[in-house]
Interface confidence: low
């Protein structure tokens, strides 16, 4: 009986398969006269149609690469694997969709880097003092978690340039704290102290050697830092194989895109990296600070994963900014920052609990729905993350992409990656929206009333001015 | 397409000098259409960037334009024990600029202020400052509200209550039909921002040149305050002028403060004693809501509406993924005395970081409909994130949601082309409002003139056979 | 292009008045000024006022204020210029230029000798 | 009103010599300085707009510079042709004003 494929008047194999997934076209050309040639495959079959001739395609998932998950992150970083598979090619026809998984495991002793960027505006001073011996501590603490810890050490105050700093008179150029009668450093943006390193009394000693500055209004600009700390991978010394955590310490509020007008600088932030040899942020007075938007970004990129370690009176703005910038955790810094090294401890147990999927460069055409086996091997619809894990567990997700239409490229790809992990599943996608008849279409054909169209895949396709069955 | 988008006139200035930056329609006493440009870059007579202001004659092949002569030598000068100085170097004369009548308003947000007496100071500090000129008569006076003899230890004994030193006045401009100056100085009372008002009549008549310090009698500011929610919300940052309380002899201001409330952002409507009439909140911490503000009346009611852009709002997208596309609210004003309520529409930019909301400016009737029109720029949008401008038209509901006209950018990526905009002026004399868009990383304006409407009707006739 | 053609010479009497035209063609009359100079025997270039078609908006310098009158009709894209109680120091050549849109007299009649004598 | 004062008043120069006719402003008009030609029973003629702006068809010997009080016209290499009288004139604010003309004369 009629069906959705032969009550559409379709007259192509192309426009068949874009109907449904379940309709099926016979290029035969025995076909029996008024028999569909659009119609569902074991109408087609009952037709009388040879199988051959039957263009059908199936939609399919195949893997390309799958090494197996790791247990251990020590031994040679490169190798490991934390995401399974790594490569998969998806098939679909049109408004057809295709399921597969991905597992994703939190290997133990996984490498840590760890950055700590830190405001040393005025009021900064005594938390100096708490973290004189924070690199031994945090050395010691981390040890529990990984065998290979490496720490580093940046600054900053805000942008150096009038109304935020002090410019008059001469004397407070080189000493901001000069009416106060009280001797402080000149100001400066954000400087890079200490390359990532596993000598940690070096974090040490360098931070003893730090002082304060002093800026004029109550938002700092550690935004500008963050940004520069993210993406001066080099100058920091990010590894590629290791957890990034960019420790951010302030007790006031922060400089926000759009701000910089304030000061006359309107060139947006443009997200590179501009610290030069002198370990200073060179573009400091000339660009803005980042957006949100170009923050998250760039963390994502790089797989940071951004702490805001803040006094309780602006841990709900951060918890706010938290919010918008996806993986980011908030911890409460106790008014000197004595206790940062337990809030450092917890904030990776939090970020090392949780796995959370993010999808790169979808194609317009795709969706995906996501379904997640967390602990004990229970389904959770709709969920793409997994909280409450402990290092070394494994969770699943079942993902189902569906393409709506025939998008005009025929082939792209995207990436699903867990959040603050370098590890990724590419998924390689073929729109199937051709028929392999179309291979062998016959321009002129003298089955087409002696050359006025195509014959293509069992019908004539009529050149211009020519309608009817045999462009008659 | 109402605005043709082929036959464009480019006016440019000079190379660095972010001609662009703010812009509008200059009328002189004549009825001359010209078109004011701020260039707060430029190179004053010491190779010193003091910006500078330049008025373009209308022409149709455009062209380069001849600058505004103002002062802009620094200024010293003693009184009894004191010396006023004024620091013009990097003021950013231009970063805005207002025509009223036949007067330019040019404003230069950053001029530097100090007073020193014996070894003590007010401190150098950006008041701001704008220039006033009458071209055709050569007529100049200055409005400097932020200045004063204070010095330091004052401020900080008074736990820095009233501090105007950092004000930044005519960071924005308006004037009232009646001809008072409104400025927006987003950095007064440290950071709160406030607003000054003057009428450009008795900025005229009170200046004195070389004066430096005097009193505008006529003039008031807004007030300080102590609540947090203000506190760095930099109010001020945009304002515009309206009609929001039904009475038809007072005007309403409208200030964009887009940092409100630890980066919310808010925008208010005061009366003219800058008691507030409504407050609306933005809704998306830093996504710098009430950074354009702009007033028409879009529905064909007789009553002002407003907008207000977001350019750093961010849209939750596929997979829950925060894109930063901008945003820009209508708010409709109802009939009698109820409050602006939720937003009548929501028209959210498209591309990622393309600053949709950036800058905003009604446009009058383009399309002759009865129903006024609006343009919205996203300086980073369009193809390699160049600079767009979209046209939404007004209809009785409000706006129509998909932009009638999409303007992209004719200069280079990084033009900032939308930065400003001003429409709603006949430059061409054909009795259609045109458009004038700034881009000032091109250094460049680009005048875009509407076309009449073809309004096309269809008759068949069928022949008996 | 551009032109802009003068009526011819003229001889007055001291007391009299004179009205000299000047006919534009080659832009759009009404969006431009056209402003009047003068120039004496040997003497330097002297300017008298404006008018602007759109609207007929006039300006003059003090000096001339009420002896001149300048009208335009924009049927003919003609601008005129009377002077009245003219005096020997009134001789001179007359010029009409146009005032366009770079703020500039970029076009200029070929001028009309006026001739003030008894 | 403005006064603009130009020097010298007269000039005889020699062919391909160099020529330069200055303009004083008695205030500050910026750039809105212009520079015309008259030649014997001619109307003028402009030759720079904006103190430095050649108009198209002047010859490349003319150039002009300045800005503020301070302006020159200067004619590299003169030719028989360039003998006039050069006058300049500001639009900087009304009344516009013509400087008294400097009459150049070919020896």
């Known amino acids: 009986g009629p069906n959705i494929c032969t009550t559409r008047g379709v007259s192509s194999c192309q426009q068949c398969l874009a109907v449904s997934p379940m309709c099926a076209w016979c290029s035969d050309e025995a076909l029996p006269l008024g028999s569909p040639r659009c119609d569902l495959k074991e109408n087609l079959l009952k037709d009388n149609c040879a199988p051959e001739s039957i263009e059908f395609p199936v939609s399919e998932a195949r893997v390309l690469e799958d090494r197996p998950l790791s247990d251990k992150g020590s031994g040679d970083s490169s190798q490991v694997t934390q995401v399974s598979p790594q490569r998969i090619a998806l098939r679909l026809r049109p408004d057809d969709s295709k399921n597969f998984s991905i597992q994703v495991r939190q290997v133990e002793d996984y490498p840590v880097d760890i950055y700590y960027l830190m405001d040393l505006s005025y009021s900064m001073k005594d938390d100096l003092w708490s973290i004189q011996n924070l690199g031994t501590k945090l050395a010691t603490q981390m040890r529990k978690l990984t065998s290979n810890l490496r720490i580093g050490f940046g600054a900053f105050v805000d942008k150096p340039v009038s109304p935020y700093m002090y410019i008059s008179p001469p004397e407070a150029l080189e000493n901001p704290c000069y009416d106060m009668k009280t001797t402080c450093l000149p100001m400066f943006g954000y400087k890079h102290v200490l390359t990532l390193t596993d000598q940690v009394t070096r974090f040490n000693e360098e931070v003893k050697k730090q002082s304060v500055s002093r800026n004029r209004d109550a938002p700092e600009g550690g935004f500008d830092a963050i940004m520069q700390a993210t993406v001066c991978d080099e100058k920091i010394g990010w590894r590629n194989d290791a957890s990034h955590l960019l420790v951010f310490t302030t007790d006031a509020k922060t400089h926000i895109a759009l701000d910089g007008r304030l000061a006359g600088i309107v060139q947006p932030n443009d997200g590179q990296c501009h610290v030069g040899s002198d370990n200073h942020y060179s573009a400091s007075t000339t660009m803005d600070y980042p957006s949100l938007g170009l923050m998250t970004e760039k963390l994502s990129q790089k797989n940071i994963n951004l702490i805001f370690a803040v006094t309780e009176n602006v841990v709900n703005l951060y918890q706010n900014y938290s919010e918008l910038i996806p993986g980011t955790t908030v911890g409460v810094l106790s008014m000197d920052s004595s206790n940062v090294l337990q809030l450092i401890v917890d904030a990776y147990g939090k970020i090392r609990s949780k796995v959370e999927l993010e999808v790169r460069d979808l194609p317009e055409e795709l969706s995906l729905s996501f379904n997640a086996t967390c602990l004990n091997n229970e389904v959770i619809p709709g969920l793409k993350s997994c909280m409450g894990l402990k290092i070394g567990d494994t969770v699943s997700f079942s993902i189902e992409a569906k393409v709506r239409g025939c998008p005009q490229e025929k082939e792209k790809s995207f990436t699903i990656k867990p959040v603050g992990f370098k590890d990724s599943l590419i998924v390689q996608v073929t729109f199937d929206c051709d028929c392999a008849c179309q291979a062998q279409a016959e321009p002129n054909s003298h089955r087409c009333n002696n050359g006025n169209g195509t014959f293509e895949c069992g019908v004539c396709r009529c050149g211009p001015g020519w309608l009817g069955s045999q462009c008659e | 397409l109402n605005l043709d988008p082929v036959q464009l006139t480019f006016y440019a200035g000079p190379n660095g000098s972010q001609f662009g930056f703010s812009l509008d329609f200059h009328k002189d006493s004549h009825g001359r259409v010209a078109i004011v440009v701020g260039a707060p870059r430029t190179l004053g007579p010491s190779q010193e960037e003091t910006g500078g202001v330049f008025l373009c004659p209308w022409r149709a092949e455009g062209g380069q334009c001849p600058s505004l002569l103002f002062d802009l030598r620094d200024e010293t000068r003693n009184v009894g024990s004191q010396t006023l100085q004024t620091f013009k170097a990097r003021q950013g004369l231009g970063a805005s600029v207002v025509s009223w009548s036949d007067v330019i308003v040019a404003c230069a947000p950053w001029q530097h202020w100090n007073v020193l007496e014996k070894t003590e100071e007010a401190e150098k500090t950006p008041v701001g400052s704008c220039f006033l000129a009458q071209p055709e008569s050569g007529r100049r006076a200055e409005y400097s509200p932020c200045r004063g003899n204070t010095l330091s230890r004052i401020y900080v004994e008074n736990d820095f209550s009233w501090d105007k030193r950092y004000c930044e006045a005519g960071f924005s401009s308006v004037v009232t039909q009646a001809g008072e100056l409104v400025l927006g100085a987003p950095g007064g009372y440290y950071f709160l921002g406030l607003l000054a008002q003057a009428p450009v009549a008795d900025i005229f008549s009170s200046y004195r040149p070389g004066i430096l310090l005097w009193h505008v009698s006529s003039q008031s500011l807004s007030f300080d305050s102590s609540n947090p929610e203000y506190f760095d919300g930099y109010w001020g940052y945009s304002v515009a002028v309206g009609e929001f309380d039904g009475d038809l002899n007072t005007t309403e201001y409208v200030v964009g403060a887009p940092t409100w409330s630890w980066t919310l952002g808010a925008v208010e409507i005061l009366d003219s004693y800058y008691q507030r009439l409504h407050r609306l909140r933005g809704e998306q911490m830093a996504s710098y809501f009430g950074h354009s503000v702009a007033v028409t009346d879009v529905n064909g009611d007789g009553r002002h509406d407003l907008l207000v852009g977001a350019p750093l709002y961010m849209e939750s997208r596929a997979d829950r993924k925060l894109a930063e596309v901008g945003r820009v609210y209508l708010f409709l004003q109802p009939r009698g005395p109820h409050a602006l309520g939720a937003p009548s529409l929501l028209l959210t930019g498209t591309q990622l970081y393309g600053r949709f909301g950036s800058a905003i400016a009604p446009l009058g009737d383009l399309d002759r409909d009865g129903y006024n029109d609006i343009a919205v720029a996203a300086p980073y949008g369009g193809p390699s994130g160049r600079g767009q401008v979209l046209v939404f038209l007004g209809q009785s509901e409000g706006l129509r949601s998909r932009p009638s006209q999409v303007l992209d950018s004719p200069f280079p990526t990084g033009s900032a082309f939308g930065f400003s905009l001003r429409g709603a002026v006949d430059i061409d004399d054909n009795g259609y409002p045109d458009l004038i868009v700034g881009a000032y990383g091109a250094n460049q304006v680009a005048v875009y003139r509407a076309q009449p409407v073809v309004k096309a009707s269809v008759q068949l006739l069928v022949q008996d056979s | 292009q551009v032109q802009l053609v003068q009526s011819g010479a003229e001889v007055k009497k001291p007391g009299a008045s004179v009205k000299v035209s000047c006919k534009a063609s080659?832009?759009?009359?009404?969006?431009?000024?056209m402003h009047w100079v003068r120039q004496a025997p040997g003497q330097g270039l002297e300017w008298i006022g404006a008018i602007y078609p759109g609207n007929s908006d006039t300006s003059y310098i003090q000096k001339f204020k009420g002896r001149v009158t300048m009208t335009r009709d924009t049927s003919t894209s003609t601008v005129y210029m009377e002077l009245s109680s003219l005096r020997s120091e009134d001789t001179a050549v007359y010029y009409c230029t146009l005032y366009d849109g770079y703020y500039v007299f970029a076009y200029w009649g070929q001028g009309t000798l006026v001739t003030v004598s008894s | 009103e403005i006064v603009l004062t130009q020097s010298p008043d007269f000039q005889s120069v020699t062919p391909k010599e160099k020529v330069t006719i200055t303009c004083r402003a008695s205030r500050d008009i910026s750039n809105n300085l212009h520079w015309f030609q008259q030649k014997p029973d001619q109307s003028p003629k402009l030759l720079i707009k904006y103190a430095s702006q050649s108009m198209s068809g002047v010859p490349s010997r003319f150039s002009g510079s300045g800005s503020g009080t301070d302006f020159t016209l200067t004619i590299n290499s003169l030719e028989a042709e360039d003998a006039a009288t050069y006058y300049c004139q500001q639009t900087n604010s009304w009344p516009y004003t013509f400087g008294q003309g400097t009459k150049l004369e070919i020896k």
């Open positions: 080659g832009y759009t009359f009404t969006n431009y000024w």
